[in-house]
C-alpha cells in the first residue's frame, strides 16, 4: 500500500496590478494531478502582512485570490493542495507548502514620507485629505497623491491639490462614484532633486470618515407645563435620517448643563416653571447602522428661549 502524495501548487506568486495595495495571489495546479482526474482539488491559502501575528486563511477551488494589503510593509503567503478522502479513497491528503513574498523596495528614509495624513469625507459628498511634508525635506520636495477603489480601471492622480509655499499639502477629490463600503487605497509619493522620498500607503472606507454638516432648524415646543420638546432637522445632503446619531447640549439659566445622545431629531426636556432661559445646540455623527466609525459635525447655531411663554410661541431660527 503506497502512501498517496500530492504536490504543492506551481508558480505561486503575488502580483501587484498597480492598485496601491489590492494584490492578486495566483498559482497553477500541482504537477501529476492525473492520478486525481475525478477529483475536485482545493487549495488552502494563508497570507499576512509581515509583522502581523495572525495569518488570514482561505480555502478555494480557484487558481487565484485577491485582497488588500498594507504596502508600507512586506507581504508573505503560503499555499498547499488539499485532497478530501474521496480523491484518495482513503484519508485526507495535503501537500507541503509553497511560499512566496512581496514587498515594494523602499526609497528614501522613513522621515521623508508625509506626516499626519488626515482624510475626511465631508457630508458623505466631498473627500479631502491633508498632510504635512516629511521631516527635514527641502522646499523642492513635492508630494503626489494617487488613489484607487474597486470600480476604477486604474489608479488616478489627484487633480486638485491644496498647496502651501508651492508644496502640495492636500488633495480635494472629485465626485467619487460608488466608492463607499469598499476599501479606498491611497499612495502619497514624492520627488526631490536632493534625495529620494519614501512613499506612504493608506487604506480606509469612506463611510467611516464622514463628517456631516450640523443639524438645522432648531425649535422649541411646549408639550406640557413641565416638558419642552426640542426639535431639529437633518442637514441637507445625501445622508438619510436613519444614519444619524445626535449629541445635544442644553443650558438652563446659564447654570445647568445637560448633555444627551439621541437617535431621533427630537428630545424632551423636563423643566420647571422658574426656567427663564433655555439654550441648546446639536451636532450629528453617522451611526453604527451605517458605518463603523465617524466624525462629529460642528455644533449647530445656538437656539435660545428667554422669558416667553412657550405655549404661545414656537421659536425658529
Amino acid at each position: 500500500d503506497t502512501e498517496i502524495k500530492v504536490n504543492p501548487p506551481q508558480d505561486f506568486e503575488i502580483v501587484d496590478p498597480g492598485y496601491l495595495g489590492y494584490l492578486y495571489l495566483q498559482w497553477q495546479p500541482p504537477l501529476s494531478l492525473d492520478h486525481f482526474k475525478e477529483c475536485t482539488v482545493e487549495y488552502e491559502l494563508k497570507y499576512r502582512n509581515i509583522g502581523s501575528e495572525t495569518w488570514k486563511t482561505i480555502i478555494t477551488k480557484n487558481l487565484h485570490y485577491k485582497d488588500g494589503f498594507d504596502l508600507n510593509k512586506g507581504i508573505e503567503a503560503k499555499i498547499h493542495t488539499l485532497l478530501p478522502w474521496q480523491c484518495t479513497n482513503g484519508s485526507e491528503v495535503q501537500s507541503s507548502w509553497a511560499e512566496t513574498t512581496y514587498w515594494i523596495s523602499p526609497q528614501g528614509i522613513p522621515e521623508t514620507k508625509v506626516q499626519d495624513m488626515d482624510c475626511v469625507y465631508y457630508n458623505w459628498q466631498y473627500l479631502l485629505c491633508s498632510w504635512k511634508p516629511g521631516i527635514g525635506v527641502l522646499l523642492d520636495t513635492n508630494y503626489n497623491l494617487f488613489y484607487w477603489y474597486e470600480g476604477l480601471d486604474h489608479a488616478l492622480q489627484c487633480v486638485d491639490y491644496i498647496k502651501a509655499d508651492g508644496q502640495n499639502i492636500g488633495c480635494r477629490f472629485p465626485y467619487l462614484e460608488a466608492s463607499d463600503y469598499k476599501d479606498f487605497y491611497i499612495c502619497v509619493n514624492g520627488s526631490s532633486e536632493n534625495k529620494p522620498i519614501r512613499s506612504s500607503y493608506f487604506t480606509f472606507q469612506l463611510q467611516n470618515i464622514v463628517k456631516p454638516l450640523p443639524p438645522v432648524y432648531l425649535t422649541f415646543t411646549r408639550e406640557s407645563s413641565c416638558e419642552i420638546k426640542l426639535k431639529w432637522s437633518i442637514p441637507l445632503g445625501p445622508i438619510p435620517a436613519r444614519c444619524f446619531d445626535y449629541e445635544i447640549e442644553i443650558r438652563e439659566d446659564d447654570t445647568t448643563l445637560v448633555t444627551a445622545t439621541v437617535e431621533n431629531e427630537t428630545y424632551t426636556l423636563k423643566t420647571t416653571n422658574e426656567t427663564r432661559q433655555l439654550c441648546f445646540v446639536v451636532r450629528s455623527k453617522v451611526n453604527i447602522y451605517c458605518s463603523d466609525d465617524g466624525i462629529w459635525s460642528e455644533w449647530s447655531d445656538k437656539q435660545c428661549w428667554e422669558g416667553e411663554d412657550l405655549s404661545k410661541k414656537t421659536l425658529l431660527r
Epitope: 475536485t40 482545493e42 482561505i58 477551488k61 485570490y65 484519508s91 485526507e92
Partner: antibody, heavy 121, light 108 residues
Framework: EVQLLESGGGLVQPGGSLRLSCAAS????????MNWVRQAPGKGLEWVSA????????YYADSVKGRFTISRDNSKNTLYLQMNSLRAEDTAVYYC??????WGAGAFDYWGQGTLVTVSS | DIQMTQSPSTLSASVGDRVTITCRAS??????LAWYQQKPGKAPKLLIY???SLESGVPSRFSGSGSGTEFTLTISSLQPDDFATYYC??????????FGQGTKVEIK
C-alpha cells in the same frame, strides 16, 4: 440512515458559555468535514464554523472568531461547538451539517434538527 | 467575502406554476453553488449541488442552472409540498461560506 442529533442548547446570560454537541450515525463520521450553521429567529441561514475530517483544520465566521471553538471526537462520532462570551446576537437555532464532498465545507447533504440557544439576561 | 443575492424575496404562486428563483454571486464562483429548501421549524434540505446536480431523492421537477455569477432554481410544476423558503449557498471560497437571504414561495 444518516442521523445528526444536536444537544446542549438552552438559555444563557450574556457573557456566559455553552457547549453544543452533535452525535452522528449512519455514515463514516471520520471521513467527512462537518460544519455548524445557525439561524436567528425569523432570519436566514448564517454559516458559523467548519472542521475537516481529521480535525486538524478549523475555520470560523468573523462574527464568532476568538469566541467559539469547533472540535470533533472521531472515536465518539461527535462534533462539538464550545461557545464563550455569548452575546444577544448569538441567539439562534444551531444546526450541525455534514459536508457532501470537500475538505472543510461544501454542499451540506445532511442536517441535524437544530438546538436553540437563547442569550438573554 | 462573496455576497449572494437572491431574488425575489417573496414569490406568490399557484399549484402547477413554473417557478424560477435567481441567485447572483458578487464574483465568479464557477459552479460551486447549492440550493436548499426549508420549511418552518425544520432543518434545511439539500436540493441541488454543484449548480445543477440533483440530490438523491429530490423530485425531478427541481432543477438548477447557471455558472459564474448567475444561477437559477426552477420548479417546473409547483406542488403543495413545495411552499417553503429556498436558499442558495456558495462554497467556492471560504471562510466564510455564504448563503443568499432566502426566497419565500407562498400560495397566491
Amino acid at each position: 440512515e444518516v442521523q445528526l442529533l444536536e444537544s446542549g442548547g438552552g438559555l444563557v446570560q450574556p457573557g456566559g458559555s455553552l457547549r453544543l454537541s452533535c452525535a452522528a450515525s449512519g455514515f463514516t463520521f471520520s471521513r467527512y468535514a462537518m460544519n455548524w450553521v445557525r439561524q436567528a429567529p425569523g432570519k436566514g441561514l448564517e454559516w458559523v464554523s467548519a472542521i475537516n475530517a481529521s480535525g486538524g483544520s478549523t475555520y470560523y465566521a468573523d462574527s464568532v472568531k476568538g469566541r467559539f471553538t469547533i472540535s470533533r471526537d472521531n472515536s465518539k462520532n461527535t462534533l462539538y461547538l464550545q461557545m464563550n462570551s455569548l452575546r444577544a446576537e448569538d441567539t439562534a437555532v444551531y444546526y450541525c451539517a455534514k459536508v457532501r464532498y470537500g475538505w472543510g465545507a461544501g454542499a451540506f447533504d445532511y442536517w441535524g434538527q437544530g438546538t436553540l440557544v437563547t442569550v438573554s439576561s | 467575502d462573496i455576497q449572494m443575492t437572491q431574488s425575489p424575496s417573496t414569490l406568490s404562486a399557484s399549484v402547477g406554476d413554473r417557478v424560477t428563483i435567481t441567485c447572483r454571486a458578487s464574483q465568479s464562483i464557477s459552479s460551486w453553488l447549492a440550493w436548499y429548501q426549508q420549511k418552518p421549524g425544520k432543518a434545511p434540505k439539500l436540493l441541488i449541488y454543484d449548480a445543477s446536480s440533483l440530490e438523491s431523492g429530490v423530485p425531478s421537477r427541481f432543477s438548477g442552472s447557471g455558472s459564474g455569477t448567475e444561477f437559477t432554481l426552477t420548479i417546473s410544476s409547483l406542488q403543495p409540498d413545495d411552499f417553503a423558503t429556498y436558499y442558495c449557498q456558495q462554497y467556492d471560497t471560504y471562510p466564510p461560506i455564504t448563503f443568499g437571504q432566502g426566497t419565500k414561495v407562498e400560495i397566491k
